[in-house]
């Protein structure tokens, strides 16, 4: 899977959208790596 910063950001945005934003506060692009997915 793509692990560039932009890919990680878009993947996280999709995850946040699907979860209704109910995730930990520190679950932000600069805190998670591609392995988080």
């Amino acid at each position: 899977a793509c692990d560039t910063a932009t890919c990680v950001t878009h993947r996280l945005a999709g995850l946040l959208s699907r979860s209704g934003g109910v995730v930990k506060n520190n679950f932000v692009p600069t805190n998670v790596g591609s392995k988080a997915f």
Epitope: C2, T4, A5, C7, T9, L16, V28, T30
Partner: antibody, heavy 119, light 107 residues
């Protein structure tokens, strides 16, 4: 309102260095990567690199490795791009850009900083 | 580096026309492609990410498609404010790379 506000135009001599700033507001600066892109007159956009303001990790386009340095000042929510050993081909508009998720999912760009390299 | 080849480099069209711009990657980039609009003297404006998703506020007449190596940006009914230069970008691999641009001019 998310804003990326860049420093003003610069005129430099060949061999000199330039440092462009990008002041972020309206979001949590350390949560999102900052990209730097340039555009020489009449040319395509060219990616310089990105920086993680949280841990200051960087990725550089090899074309600029060793000449470009990306840094941040977390306390001032400001990103910097320094380019050294300037040559005439570095004359371009330099942009900072960041994809933000909160408060609004969008790819925000600074207004651009014109750097002119001329003897 | 991945090369992004855009075509055409320029085109002339009229208000109301359907416009299609293509972008070909030199290797597989999955759907990790973005499209930007740029007007003279202005910063690029993001339109599309992940090949086919519109950012909020981008008019529905803009649509993107494609995966792998072949991508398309379509403007279904060209409006006066759409005359600009459009760029594709791949962000699947470092360094991110952009296409050469397509200038959409008034016929």
């Amino acid at each position: 309102e998310v804003q990326l506000v860049q420093s003003g135009a610069e005129v430099k001599k060949p061999g000199a260095s330039v440092k462009v700033s990008c002041k972020a507001s309206g979001y949590t600066f350390t949560d999102y990567y900052m990209n730097w892109v340039r555009q020489a007159p009449g040319q395509r956009l060219e990616w310089i690199g990105d920086i993680n303001p949280n841990n200051v990790g960087t990725n550089y386009n090899q074309k600029f490795k060793g000449r470009a340095t990306l840094t941040v000042d977390k306390s001032a929510s400001t990103a910097y791009m320094e380019l050294s050993s300037l040559r005439s081909e570095d004359t371009a508009v330099y942009y900072c850009a960041s994809i933000i998720i909160v408060p609004n999912y969008f790819d925000y760009w600074g207004q651009g900083t014109t750097v002119t390299v001329s003897s | 580096d991945i090369q992004m080849t855009q075509s055409p480099s320029s085109l002339s069209a009229s208000v109301g026309d359907r416009v299609t711009i293509t972008c070909k990657a030199s290797q597989n980039v999955d759907t990790n492609v973005a499209w930007f609009q740029q007007k003279p003297g202005k910063a690029p404006k993001s339109l599309i990410y992940s090949a086919s998703y519109r950012y909020s506020g981008v008019p529905s007449r803009f649509s993107g498609s494609g995966s792998g190596t072949d991508f398309t940006l379509t403007i279904s009914s060209l409006q006066p404010e759409d005359f600009a230069t459009y760029y594709c970008q791949q962000y699947n691999n470092y360094p991110y790379t952009f296409g050469g641009g397509t200038k959409v001019e008034i016929k």
